[in-house]
């Protein structure tokens, strides 16, 4: 391992406010290989038994400012005949992601980390059947 001497301009990790004030390089390096990306399906949203649509969620005060969000097309699932199956429900699969939100009262390059729940697709589950006791 190569030890890099700490520069005077680097923040001190021991400082109390280190985790509150971190400089982040926002340049995105695409780590996915071409093969992995080409296998990523874009047609599942139509082929699924619980199909979904995608909407472009824009927030100029957020990084990333554009996030594509899924919404289930139907409350029920679609059967092999293309009809809605009332014994099966479409449910949204959500993922919690971290985003940076601009702090408007501060300079335009000051952000805070926020959690955001994003719909990434839908899946089909059986309806809960409640038996009368």
């Amino acid at each position: 391992a190569v030890l890099i001497p700490q520069s005077s301009v680097c923040p001190n990790a021991e400082a109390n406010n280190f985790l509150q004030n971190v400089k982040v390089n926002l340049k995105v390096i695409n780590s996915l290989s071409s093969k992995a990306s080409s296998r990523r399906p874009s047609d599942y949203l139509n082929r699924s038994t619980s199909p979904w649509t995608l909407s472009r969620n824009e927030d100029p005060d957020r990084y990333p400012s554009v996030i594509w969000e899924a919404q289930c097309r139907h409350q029920r699932c679609v059967n092999a005949e293309g009809k809605l199956d009332h014994h099966m429900n479409s449910v949204l699969i959500q993922q919690e992601i971290l985003v940076l939100k601009r702090e408007p009262e501060k300079c335009p390059f000051t952000f805070r980390v926020e959690k955001m729940l994003v719909g990434v697709g839908c899946t089909c589950v059986s309806s809960i059947v409640r038996h009368a006791s």
Epitope: L26, K27, V28, N30, L32, S34, S37, S38, R40, S42, D43, L45, N46, T53, L54, S55, R56, E58, P60, D61, Y63, P64, S65, V66, W68, P108
Partner: antibody, heavy 119, light 107 residues
Framework: EVQLVQSGAEVKKPGASVKVSCKAS????????FHWVRQAPGQGLEWIGV????????AYNQNFRDRATLTADKSTSTAYMELSSLRSEDTAVYYC????????????WGQGTLVTVSS | NIVMTQSPSSLSASVGDRVTITCKAS??????VGWFQQKPGKSPKLLIY???NRYTGVPSRFSGSGSGTDFTFTISSLQPEDFATYFC?????????FGQGTKLEIK
């Protein structure tokens, strides 16, 4: 080298449809959004809509929502813009452009496709 | 929709001149403004993004400034190849909109 190569000029009659293609090369097709913009003769640029080839999502300018359809074919790294119910005022050069979603700007543009609508 | 009002619509200048084009947004667009150059029969070419960042390979004579609603694009010393039409564009929120363009002609 990133390249966006569009299909050739088209002449259409009013009421017809046109489908313009944009073939991408030099990068991973599914990583970035494709936007479509048009420019009528001697006019400014007008945004039509966007498709993300990675997830199939689309969004449209309200003015084109009922007539424009954006699609993408990952197997050929090609994006398409279909415009239906053509009228004379749709005569324009149509451009595809790549949008860097994280960085937030259009970097590469196709060479443009002239669509002429005339009876 | 956000309206981008660009001025002047046309401009005559000589090689070596300093030229300034302005763009005013109908509402705040933060710094989400780009500037493009377009030559006849060609597609737009990105010069400036995020109001003031020069795109890769763009000569230093091109610069941009501004935030909120007022933006400025400057060519410090005009070169013969700079005579073209210039557009501003906002990508703050869709539908993304463009200025009407400034045609820069040789005096």
């Amino acid at each position: 080298e990133v390249q966006l190569v569009q299909s050739g000029a088209e002449v259409k009659k009013p009421g017809a449809s046109v489908k313009v293609s944009c073939k991408a090369s030099g990068y991973t097709f599914t990583d970035y959004e494709f936007h479509w913009v048009r420019q009528a003769p001697g006019q400014g640029l007008e945004w039509i809509g966007v498709i993300h080839p990675g997830n199939g999502g689309t969004a449209y300018n309200q003015n084109f929502r009922d007539r424009a359809t954006l699609t993408a074919d990952k197997s050929t790294s090609t994006a398409y813009m279909e415009l239906s119910s053509l009228r004379s005022e749709d005569t324009a050069v149509y451009y595809c452009t790549r949008f860097l979603t994280y960085e937030g700007y259009f970097d590469y543009w196709g060479q443009g496709t002239l669509v002429t609508v005339s009876s | 929709n956000i309206v981008m009002t660009q001025s002047p619509s046309s401009l005559s200048a000589s090689v070596g001149d300093r030229v300034t084009i302005t763009c005013k947004a109908s509402q705040s667009v933060s710094i989400d403004v780009g500037w493009f150059q377009q030559k006849p029969g060609k597609s737009p070419k990105l010069l400036i993004y995020h109001a003031s960042n020069r795109y890769t390979g763009v000569p230093s004579r091109f610069s941009g400034s501004g935030s909120g609603t007022d933006f400025t694009f400057t060519i410090s010393s005009l070169q013969p190849e700079d005579f073209a039409t210039y557009f501003c564009q906002q990508d703050y929120s869709s539908p993304y909109t463009f200025g009407q363009g400034t045609k820069l002609e040789i005096k």
